[in-house]
């Protein structure tokens, strides 16, 4: 039973990751209520004394918000009535990582669920042919990563080949002194082959593919968040 003898309600969260300096979403849904004024949403964080965010009686209640989240949080007010308690977190900081609790009180009861939020930096790699090099060379660049990722090259033709001896990877600290630019160069590239530059840390995995033929160059890239059901 919840407060005032009310039953517990189902609250569901999804583990997610935030990209430093960008906006993030902490996902939370609950059994909806028919009256917005009866819904209270509270977000709390381990290690933080005040609330991350509070929404009650149809509006934000900021008096108990912890100073580290001031001006950076919002719920989707028009979606609360249908059971969306997700939190928008602006300008994600490295220190935003941790355990959060989405706590809901409605006329039906109360419930809560924890959410693990990871923070870091991740970006799409772009693979290009380096025409300045003396031999056929590919250059894979990704502007923002943190923590420092691993970079692995692969090829469609030479599956299972280890390219560590013919590649060189460097990490250059960006101006904000947290994230880094990733540059990896692959030498001795053969034509009519598809090469993949795979960048991975504990938050995300990104792949940049390039297919080089005599007549054209085709590129493709994608990014996947790890340990996240999003």
């Amino acid at each position: 039973f919840g407060i005032s003898g009310r039953h517990s309600i189902t609250v569901t969260t999804v583990a997610s990751a935030g990209n430093i300096g960008e906006d993030g979403i902490l996902s939370c849904t609950f059994e909806p209520d028919i009256k917005l004024s009866d819904i209270v949403i509270q977000w709390l964080k381990e290690g933080v004394l005040g609330l991350v965010h509070e929404f009650k009686e149809g509006k934000d209640e900021l008096s108990e918000q912890d100073e580290m989240f001031r001006g950076r949080t919002a719920v989707f007010a028009d979606q609360v009535i249908v059971g969306n308690a997700s939190l928008r977190l602006k300008n994600v900081q490295l220190t935003d990582a941790g355990t959060y609790k989405c706590y809901i009180i409605t006329s039906k009861g109360k419930g809560n669920a924890n959410l693990e939020y990871k923070t870091g930096a991740f970006s799409m790699p772009e693979v290009n042919v380096d025409y300045n090099a003396s031999s056929e060379t590919l250059r894979c660049e990704a502007p923002r990563w943190f923590p420092q990722p691993t970079v692995v090259w692969a090829s469609q033709v030479d599956q299972g080949a280890n390219f560590s001896e013919v590649s060189n990877t460097s990490f250059e600290l960006n101006s904000e002194n947290v994230t880094m630019k990733v540059v990896s160069v692959l030498y001795n590239v053969t034509i009519n082959n598809t090469y993949s530059c795979m960048i991975e840390n504990d938050i995300a995995k990104a792949t940049g593919d390039i297919k080089v033929t005599e007549s054209e160059i085709k590129r493709r890239s994608h990014l996947q968040l790890l340990n996240s059901k999003a």
Partner: antibody, heavy 116, light 113 residues
């Protein structure tokens, strides 16, 4: 309605410890921090620290660091403030309060007297 | 840490007259993110815990008589009792809740002249 009921007055010897309790009712205890504030006789209000009951996260004023421990028991909706190595200057009324910023609800206060 | 300073320390005012208490913070308590001043005023009577009167510098707590008003922004704030009543005899405190550690002013004792 929100209520914070504190334990009774205490008389303690210098060097000893005191543990004051604060039982909360009328709201969801795990949702809001509990703050502790003290007031020496004829003096102003002084923030000691606070706790987030759901995670057990506590923050203390620099002055009390190492001498104070604030805890919370979710099962009984009770917060505790323990102050050790007591000295005569610790004689004060100790208040618990709901919230960590704006304090709308206070306990009735617990007088702690430190005397040899 | 933010330090709060009140003036005067005590104040004697005739019944029905205006009482004005000032509060100064050592740094601004105005948040640029929401344009709110994180300042509250409390009233404390002997043997009782403090009672919240005003928050966000100028918003009256429900049930507080409208003779109590708060004003100011940034670092300088004022609590005004427009027409002092006998039951207003108390000590008044300002408090910043902009950041921890929470800080209170030293208090202003209001008496009847």
């Amino acid at each position: 309605q929100v209520q914070l009921v504190q334990s009774g007055a205490e008389v303690k010897k210098p060097g000893s410890s005191v543990k004051v309790s604060c039982k909360a009712s009328g709201y969801s205890f795990i949702s809001y921090a509990i703050t502790w504030v003290r007031q020496a006789p004829g003096q102003g209000l002084e923030w000691i620290g606070g706790i987030n009951p759901i995670f057990g996260t506590a923050k203390y004023a620099q002055k009390f660091q190492g001498r104070v421990t604030i805890t919370a028991d979710e099962s009984t909706s009770t917060a505790y403030m323990e102050l050790s190595s007591l000295r005569s200057e610790d004689t004060a009324v100790y208040y618990c309060a709901k919230g960590q910023a704006l304090i709308q609800h206070w306990g009735q206060g617990t007088l702690v007297t430190v005397s040899s | 840490d933010i330090v709060m300073t009140q003036s005067p320390d005590s104040l004697a005012v005739s019944l029905g007259e205006r009482a004005t208490i000032n509060c100064k913070s050592s740094q601004s308590v105005l948040s640029s993110s929401n344009n709110k001043n994180y300042l509250a005023w409390y009233q404390q009577k002997p043997g009782q815990p403090p009672k919240l009167l005003i928050y966000w510098a100028s918003t009256r707590e429900s049930g507080v008589p409208d003779r109590f008003s708060g004003s100011g922004s940034g670092t300088d704030f004022t609590l005004t009792i427009s027409s002092l009543q006998a039951e207003d005899v108390a000590v008044y405190y300002c408090q910043q809740y902009y950041s921890t550690p929470l800080a209170f002013g030293q208090g202003t004792k209001v008496e009847i002249k």
